[in-house]
Interface confidence: low
């Protein structure tokens, strides 16, 4: 499929100007490649009327230009005082014309309306308002007013003063006799329909005195506004429909076949299955506008898509709307990254997240999308050092492996933290990405104990079993905090013998602590690593306390198998700030993420996204 | 359909205030226009007050004008007339009217079923 993308369709009258633009892939070799602009014939060719290398037809002299915009991976052809000679299938690309790195345009140039002497033309957006003024004399002031719509050759009535309207216009119509002082009436006609558009007559009186106003109204849907974004990557649609429809249901739909508009994401709590866990409806504006943000895009999700405003949260005749066109290229700059990670009740998933290596500085951040009302998805960690409440100990952000990926790592997992999680910065906003973690069945394959008290002034060694999978990844400890886990020094001390059918490959790899300080307290993790790659990891909560005794305290593993001290994890806890995004508008506008707090802490039910990629908590 | 219904009718003193409410039904509010008219017993019903869609614009009966208020909340698919130094002449029973046409005659295509406002001397 060519990358190259651009309007499918382009209307407009006799006399008037077009502008058309076109989206290439911005690599190197297309910034600087040849851009055309080429008229398709009947027998398949494709002649030139404008390039960006000078050459300009006849046909186009002196009335269009083509313009490149390499920074952006667009050029622009304009073209001005069109006639229907241009109504025609064209082609934009680049390179050669017949090598097939262009997109179709089809160009329909239509006769202006022949208009009546004195007609006043209104020219109104679907789904809008228009007031036609209707102006009388005196000596009519007291007579009939009415308005009527040409159909064919004979006028029918819409709306009169005698309390007549027209069953087209029911319950979106009305007629409005302003004070005695003015000598004007009007006919307001609300939520607009293409059907709509056409001549009007307005009158008032009925005999050969009356007073007429011609009106031409001009129904437009709203022209697609095109959006070139890469696969995996995020897009965000701003809808700003008006104040007037600031209290009606809002919602984004993709048109499919014909005309119908299957509803994506509304305000009243509907959301298509194939967008779960990868869209949110950002709060609306007092002036009714509002953002919807979608997250790693799909070959499918290229289409038309329009937002609208109406009390059923979808499309019906009349809405006002606003219309993208989306084209997904799948020349992505976006890296692959696994969209699943399965991981086990009580073990851990590390997830790799991709970002813009050129924003190597940007603030890193992970946060869990919740699907209720219309989504949203608080802050869990990020690069500057925050750690969500709830999560202390056991999740973790990492600068590894760096350029161009980050590493969260979430351990003592439960069936509660399955869901969809996202992968952001401050920095470019189309580079968030989605993935979601599942826990299936099985057992943690790093065995630690589950909960380890210390006495001041002893040496304390904790035991980490590591079977024999691992054998040729780096084992490590660590100490947790808010920036990290800052690695520790531990002991190889020989085959464990945790394991059933596992030979002498496996280990057993202890953290000592000597003199046990205060300072000792804390989460531990055990894990293993390949280079800046890592794998699974678990988490040991060590208390500290004083008690009168001597010598060393060695845990055995058969601790490891007692369940966790809930008061000793609960007690270990150190509350400190909690933080999320409490203005999802952060993520649809090109700013950093605000540092706000919020306490909320909201469901983590899991819908299968039915992808493909998977990854498992031990991979990279 | 409109369905309408007034209240905040009864007994008042020369001289005093009252405020009617007709609380709309139905669909659309916001496009029509709304009136209040009164029918004294043998008299032909007549025009009180009236108000626009919006609230811009309002007409009202040279009898009643400095001493009524028309006003509307669409909101609350409302609209009200608050009556003051009252007159026994005011006597009547006072009709809320909804047309999708303003206007200032009687031609209006909703009803409701009234309330009566006695001023006593």
């Known amino acids: 499929k060519s990358p190259i993308f651009g309007p499918e369709e382009v209307n407009s009258v006799e006399g008037n100007s077009v502008s058309i633009t076109c989206y290439y892939p911005p690599t190197s070799v297309n910034r600087h490649t040849r851009k055309y602009w080429c008229r398709q014939g009947a027998r398949g060719g494709c002649i030139t009327l404008i390039s960006s290398e000078g050459y300009v037809s006849s046909k186009y002299a002196g009335r269009a230009n083509l313009t490149n915009f390499p920074e952006n991976g667009t050029f622009v052809v304009n073209i001005a005082q069109l006639s229907q000679d241009d109504s025609g299938r064209y082609k934009c690309g680049l390179g050669i014309n017949s090598r097939g790195l262009s997109f179709d345009v089809s160009l329909e140039v239509s006769q202006g309306p022949g208009l009546l002497n004195d007609t006043k033309v209104y020219t109104v957006d679907l789904g809008r308002t228009v007031t036609i003024n209707c102006p009388f004399k005196t000596e009519n002031a007291q007579k009939r007013k009415s308005l009527y719509k040409q159909i064919g050759l004979y006028p029918v009535l819409v709306i009169d003063s005698s309390g007549y309207v027209n069953p087209n216009y029911t319950g979106r119509i009305r007629l409005d006799i302003q004070g005695t002082g003015q000598l004007l009436f009007s006919v307001v006609i609300n939520q607009l329909r293409l059907s709509d558009a056409g001549q009007y007559l307005c009158q008032a009186g009925d005999d050969s005195n009356s007073n007429k106003k011609n009106a031409d109204l001009q129904v437009l849907k709203p022209e697609p506004e095109l959006v070139y974004e890469d696969l995996r990557g995020s897009v965000t649609f701003h809808c700003a429909l008006g104040p007037e429809v600031a209290n009606v249901a809002k919602f984004l739909c993709r048109q499919s076949s014909g005309e119908n508009c299957d509803v994506v994401v509304n305000t009243l709590g509907k959301r298509a299955p194939a967008f779960e866990g990868r869209i949110l409806l950002n709060p609306q504006d007092k002036d009714g506008s509002f953002s919807v943000v979608i997250t790693g895009l799909r070959k499918e999700d290229a289409g038309r898509y329009l937002c609208g405003a109406h009390s059923d949260g979808q499309l019906q005749e009349g809405s006002p709307i606003q219309a993208w066109q989306l084209f997904v290229n799948e020349e992505s700059t976006i890296p692959r990254s696994p969209t699943v990670v399965k991981g086990v009740a009580g073990g851990s998933v590390a997830v790799l997240c991709p970002y813009n290596r050129k924003e190597s500085k940007s603030i890193k951040y992970w946060c869990l999308w919740e699907g209720a009302q219309n989504g949203r998805c608080p802050l869990l960690v990020d690069s500057e050092g925050w750690v969500k409440a709830q999560y202390e100990g056991r999740l973790s952000l990492l600068e590894e492996p760096g350029n161009g990926t980050f590493t969260v790592i979430l351990n003592q997992l439960t069936s509660r933290d399955a869901g969809f999680y996202w992968c952001l910065t401050n920095g470019d906003t189309l580079w968030r990405t989605t993935v979601e973690i599942k826990i299936i069945e099985g057992e943690p394959n790093l065995k630690v104990p589950g909960n380890v008290t210390a006495v001041l002034g002893e040496t304390l060694k904790v035991p980490c079993h590591f079977p024999c999978k691992f054998s040729s990844y780096e084992k490590y400890w660590c100490k947790w905090n808010n920036t990290g886990c800052q690695a520790l020094p531990s002991q190889d001390e020989g085959p464990s013998k945790a394991f059933v059918n596992c030979d002498e490959n496996s280990r057993l790899v202890s953290l000592t602590l000597n003199l046990v300080t205060r300072a000792d307290e804390g989460w531990y993790w055990c894990g293993v690593k390949q280079g800046h790659f890592y794998g699974e990891t678990a988490a040991v909560y060590v208390a500290v306390e004083e008690r009168k005794a001597a010598g060393s305290r060695d845990v055995s593993l058969a601790k490891a198998d007692a369940a966790p001290d809930e008061k000793v994890l609960d007690s270990g806890f150190r509350e400190i700030e909690n933080k999320a995004i409490q203005d999802p508008r952060l993520f649809a506008e090109e700013k950093a993420v605000a540092d706000t707090r919020d306490q909320a802490d909201g469901s983590r039910a899991s819908v299968d996204s039915g992808s493909s990629e998977e990854q498992g908590g031990s991979s990279r | 359909e409109v369905q309408l219904v007034e209240s905040g009718g009864g007994l008042v003193q020369s001289g005093g205030s009252l405020r009617l409410s007709c609380a709309a039904s139905g669909r659309a509010f916001n496009y029509y226009a709304m009136g209040w008219f009164r029918q004294a017993p043998g008299k032909e019903r007549e025009l009180v007050a009236v108000?626009?869609?919006?609230?811009?614009?309002?007409s009202y009966a040279d009898s009643v004008k400095g001493r009524f208020t028309i006003s509307r909340s669409n909101a609350k698919n409302t609209v009200y007339l608050q009556m003051s130094s009252l007159k026994p002449e005011d006597t009547a029973v006072y009709y809320c009217?909804?047309?999708?046409?303003?206007?200032?005659?009687?031609?209006?295509?909703?009803w409701g079923q009234g309330t009566q406002v006695t001023v006593s001397s």
């Open positions: 108000i626009n869609w919006s609230g811009g614009t309002t």
């Open positions: 009217a909804a047309d999708s046409i303003y206007r200032t005659s009687k031609d209006y295509n909703y």
